[in-house]
């Protein structure tokens, strides 16, 4: 369906054309239940809550209402060359027995998440593949989406920015056909290879997918937990080699710096993930500059010269508010012969699942 927000002159400032599927987990008296439903064709723009943004104060937003009081909101923000859906939020009424039969609670729920929906200014965002936005207990999947904000006239621009999923990648297999209903579990982050070299050659080899789990207070004093995937295509890696400390520094999307520090126990000749440091920007947080660090971790351990490997997802708790979910990790620090992984030491999680 096509949704449009206009300014006082009648010129559109936001246009969006997409279909959406919702997957919602909720509680019933007989246990948890999952409902999937589509954005109905009679969904409408809430004109008095949608806005083109007021000069110097607020950003444009598109509020779509459907059913018995449910709303989907897309809140936009812009930079000099890019704009994005900074926040997607979904307000749903568990009292709607049509969508949520046997719900044990009748409350109004609000969930939200930052998104990967971004495009060049004066170009439309285009994504034929499903774009999934994961929120607490809810996944929204946009299909065949064309979205543009900060419009100059009441029509989509000629140029477009395609989503990652739509871009052909020579190194990856073709995408799997879309599943009938979106999964409420956040999709796994892409796995990428990282290496750090110094004067004596490679001191770190790592292959892993990274997901940040952040809990913070929003401007309206509510606390939210968000999962953010590190996108390898938008991440640059650097680092340093030392006799007692190896660092891997990841810069992602211009707003996130993630630092891994590997230490070595000389007496046992074992390396381990000793520290993680994060600096990122959370636009909707009460304090947008989010920082977390812990220098006394003991994770991803293996004998120097060997590699540590774990196919199971590993959760590394950094602080109360921040942990890193590491997927399909394979890492080796300090001593890397010939730029190749050495003998594998499997994690306990993998051994238990065999």
């Amino acid at each position: 369906a096509m949704f449009m927000v206009k300014n006082g002159n009648g010129t559109a400032c936001i246009m969006a054309n997409f279909s959406a599927a919702f997957s919602v987990n909720y509680d019933t008296k007989s246990g948890p239940k999952n409902m999937t439903f589509d954005l109905p064709s009679d969904a409408t723009v809430v004109l008095n809550r949608s806005s083109c943004g007021k000069e110097n104060t607020s950003d444009p937003s598109l509020v779509i209402a459907f059913g018995r009081g449910h709303t989907l909101t897309l809140q936009f923000t812009r930079q000099a060359t890019r704009y994005s859906v900074q926040l997607m939020s979904f307000v749903y009424q568990l009292s709607d027995t049509h969508l949520f039969p046997q719900a044990s609670s009748k409350e109004i729920k609000t969930v939200e998440s930052i998104t990967d929906i971004r495009a060049d200014i004066d170009k439309k965002y285009r994504c034929v593949s499903g774009t999934q936005v994961h929120m607490n207990q809810v996944t929204v999947t946009l299909h065949d989406a064309t979205i543009q904000a900060y419009l100059s006239q009441s029509s989509f621009s000629r140029g477009e920015t395609r989503c990652e999923q739509d871009r052909p990648s020579p190194t990856t297999a073709p995408p799997a056909p879309p599943s009938p209903s979106p999964s409420p579990v956040p999709k796994s982050p892409s796995v990428d290879k990282y290496n750090v070299s110094g004067t004596n050659g490679t001191c770190l080899l790592a292959s892993m997918g990274l997901q940040l789990n952040l809990t913070y207070e929003r401007k309206d004093n509510t606390t939210v937990t968000r999962l953010l995937n590190i996108n390898p295509n938008k991440t640059s890696a650097s680092g340093s080699c030392g006799a007692h400390l190896v660092t891997l520094e990841l810069h992602s999307e211009g707003t996130t710096v993630l630092l891994f520090q590997f230490g070595m126990n000389a007496s046992s000749s074992r390396f381990f993930l000793q520290g993680i440091q994060l600096n990122t920007i959370l636009p909707d947080a009460r304090d947008p500059a989010f920082k977390a660090a812990n220098g006394s971790l003991r994770a991803l351990q293996a004998t120097v010269g060997n590699s540590y490997k774990c196919n199971a997802e590993e959760h590394v708790r950094v602080t109360k508010a921040f942990s890193v979910n590491i997927f399909k990790v394979w890492v080796q620090a300090f001593k890397v012969e010939g730029g190749q992984f050495g003998s594998v030491e499997e994690c306990l999680l993998d051994e238990n699942s065999m």
Partner: antibody, heavy 118, light 106 residues
Framework: QVQLQQSGAELVKPGASVKMSCKAS????????IHWVKKSPGQGLEWIGA????????PYSQKFKDKATLTADKSSSTTYMQLSRLTSEDSAVYYC???????????WGQGTLVSVSA | DIQMTQSPPSLSASLGGKVTITCKAS??????MAWYQDKPGKGPRLLIH???TLQPGIPSRFSGSGSGRDYSFSISNLEPEDIATYYC????????FGGGTKLEIK
């Protein structure tokens, strides 16, 4: 109508800095990027950088990122460009420019002449 | 940054004649190409945007075409007031001018 009024000519010594201004009128200042362009006999037209006054985001050309600093003051609808560590190579006319959405650089200021001389 | 290679750097033509200037981008710029006229003592003037769309008030003697990485700009039926330096500008990814072409009349 859209107008961009630039500050007057500057004569500066090598090694010094200069800050020029560009006052915008006739439109909502925070809705459009303001760009800065250098025009010199040797190099022709060169894009220096742009600033989005809404939040101060400012991408620069690789060549000018250590030379120019762009700022904006929303209250006065004015954009500023500071050039540092000036040399004779920086002698040029500097224009502030506004794009007309996706119609490239449609509106130009009258230019500020900077002369660097000992 | 995208690089723009403009040629020729200068050219001379007769009144009433036709000239063509080309610009090659270092990558596909999706037709986000503009052409400017620059005269001494004046600010540059936008002639064409989006590769081939003439700005209001610009005579149809000026034209542009191209796609991908290769673009061209032509002036037919040359007049004395066309003496100027002409620049291409890509605005697909940040902004980059070509090196300019100085047009003289024989």
């Amino acid at each position: 109508q859209v107008q961009l009024q630039q500050s007057g000519a500057e004569l500066v010594k090598p090694g010094a800095s200069v800050k020029m201004s560009c006052k915008a009128s006739g439109y909502i200042f925070t809705n459009y990027n303001i760009h800065w362009v250098k025009k010199s006999p040797g190099q022709g037209l060169e894009w220096i950088g742009a600033i989005y006054p809404g939040n101060g985001d400012a991408p620069y050309s690789q060549k000018f990122k250590d030379k120019a600093t762009l700022t904006a003051d929303k209250s006065s609808s004015t954009t500023y460009m500071q050039l540092s560590r000036l040399t004779s190579e920086d002698s040029a006319v500097y224009y502030c420019v506004r794009a007309n959405w996706d119609v490239a650089f449609a509106y130009w200021g009258q230019g500020t002449l900077v002369s660097v001389s000992a | 940054d995208i690089q723009m290679t403009q040629s020729p750097p200068s050219l001379s033509a007769s009144l009433g004649g036709k000239v063509t200037i080309t610009c090659k981008a270092s990558q596909d710029i999706d037709r986000y190409m503009a052409w400017y006229q620059d005269k001494p003592g004046k600010g540059p003037r936008l002639l064409i945007h989006d590769t081939s769309t003439l700005q209001p008030g610009i005579p149809s003697r000026f034209s542009g075409s191209g796609s991908g990485r290769d673009y061209s700009f032509s002036i037919s039926n040359l007049e004395p007031e066309d003496i100027a330096t002409y620049y291409c500008l890509q605005y697909d990814n940040l902004w980059t001018f070509g090196g300019g072409t100085k047009l003289e009349i024989k």
